[in-house]
Interface confidence: low
């Protein structure tokens, strides 16, 4: 499995789109800051088998897609940017899916690294709960956008390490 230069470009475009989605200054939302306890240890990439790392990355992309494809999300962000964001995420998920199948085979895929995947799911549950509690306010969305940018940066770094192993 080769996480190609194209995939790397997709990563950069995803981060760029996330940056451009910003609608209000983060400085006006300081009071809404929140620690979502990003499961950083799942993105260390040292102790992982390649297939495990890819599964975690795929889950990250999937959950990000789920978060930004809700009705509340489409009301908060520029539709054009969202549409482009979806396309980039889809492309990345397709690339990662191909890699998972190539690395471990179809049968094993669903059970890959369940603990790490659950950690990512719980992380996104905390984000969803925060948005609900904040009634999907513009500042809450801005805090979440900044958080997702941070987590996508970790994903990108893990993918870089995986490419170096190729």
């Amino acid at each position: 499995c080769n996480l190609s230069q194209t995939h790397s470009l997709n990563n950069r475009r995803t981060l760029m789109l996330m940056a451009q989605m910003r609608r209000i200054s983060p400085f006006s939302c300081l009071k809404d800051r929140h620690d979502f306890e990003f499961p950083q240890e799942e993105f260390d990439g040292n102790q992982f088998q390649k297939a495990q790392a890819i599964s975690v990355l795929h889950e990250m992309m999937q959950q990000t897609f789920n978060l930004f494809s809700t009705k509340n999300s489409s009301a908060a962000w520029d539709e054009t940017l969202l549409e482009k964001f979806y396309i980039e995420l889809f492309q990345q998920m397709n690339d990662l899916e191909a890699c998972v199948i190539q690395e471990v085979g179809v049968e094993e895929t669903p059970l890959m690294n369940e603990d790490s995947i659950l950690a990512v799911k719980k992380y996104f549950q905390r984000i969803t709960l925060y948005l609900m509690e904040k009634k999907y306010s513009p500042c809450a969305w801005e805090v979440v956008r900044a958080e997702i940018m941070r987590s996508l940066s970790f994903s990108t770094n893990l993918q870089k390490r995986l490419r170096r192993k190729d």
Epitope: L17, Q20, S25, D78, T80
Partner: antibody, heavy 119, light 108 residues
Framework: QVQLVQSGAEVKKPGASVKVSCKAS????????MHWVRQAPGQGLEWMGE????????IYNENFKSRVTMTRDTSTSTVYMELSSLRSEDTAVYYC????????????WGQGTLVTVSS | EIVLTQSPATLSLSPGERATLSCSAG???????LYWYQQKPGQAPRLLIY???NLASGIPARFSGSGSGTDFTLTISSLEPEDFAVYYC?????????FGQGTKLEIK
């Protein structure tokens, strides 16, 4: 091709309101935020605010917040900017400009509408 | 509010000369959101440079942009007669979006 066509020049008295329109064509109207920028005679550019034509969400510059209202009509692909409590210093050319991604940001502008406030 | 200060206010040069226009931000601007526009009398502004250093469609290669943080520059390597106009830097890094006061490039 993308076109933004604005309404004609207006002359208003101090204290009155003005409503400027901007009709968009050549692209999917609801996909891009529309912005309003004004320019007083011989002066620089000043951003007034923006509206998301899809659901009408607006973000205004605090300098205008109490006096400006931006609306849209998706059936005619038109956005409107209404400025109330006009004063002489509001005499300016008002432009609509389309938002977008990267090189599309403010790449398209209306021709401008001159609003003159005079007693 | 991020205040953008352009210098000089007026720049008098001859065709063929190199023009360097500066834009200084009161606080740091993400370079992805620093743009340059050209405006001629009676016309709407025209996008020249986006994201600090990228040339907009149809803009000649003699225009270039650079900078980061609080200091940005627009350079015209060899002035053509049609380049004499007013130039504005613009940021949409944070609300409210702002423009510099403009630099008027005039024929010497």
């Amino acid at each position: 091709q993308v076109q933004l066509v604005q309404s004609g020049a207006e002359v208003k008295k101090p204290g009155a309101s003005v409503k400027v329109s901007c009709k968009a064509s050549g692209y999917t109207f609801t996909n891009y935020w529309m912005h309003w920028v004004r320019q007083a005679p011989g002066q620089g550019l000043e951003w007034m605010g923006e509206i998301n034509p899809s659901h009408g969400r607006t973000i205004y510059n605090e300098n205008f917040k109490s006096r400006v209202t931006m609306t849209r009509d998706t059936s005619t692909s038109t956005v409107y900017m209404e400025l109330s409590s006009l004063r002489s210093e509001d005499t300016a050319v008002y432009y609509c400009a389309r938002g977008g991604l990267g090189p599309a940001w403010f790449a398209y502008w209306g021709q401008g509408t001159l609003v003159t406030v005079s007693s | 509010e991020i205040v953008l200060t352009q210098s000089p206010a007026t720049l008098s040069l001859s065709p063929g000369e190199r023009a360097t226009l500066s834009c200084s931000a009161g606080s740091s601007v993400d370079s992805s959101y620093l743009y340059w526009y050209q405006q001629k009398p009676g016309q709407a502004p025209r996008l020249l440079i986006y994201s600090t250093s990228n040339l907009a469609s149809g803009i000649p290669a003699r225009f270039s942009g650079s900078g980061s943080g609080t200091d940005f520059t627009l350079t015209i390597s060899s002035l053509e007669p049609e380049d004499f106009a007013v130039y504005y830097c613009h940021q949409w890094s944070s609300y409210p979006f702002t423009f510099g006061q403009g630099t008027k490039l005039e024929i010497k």
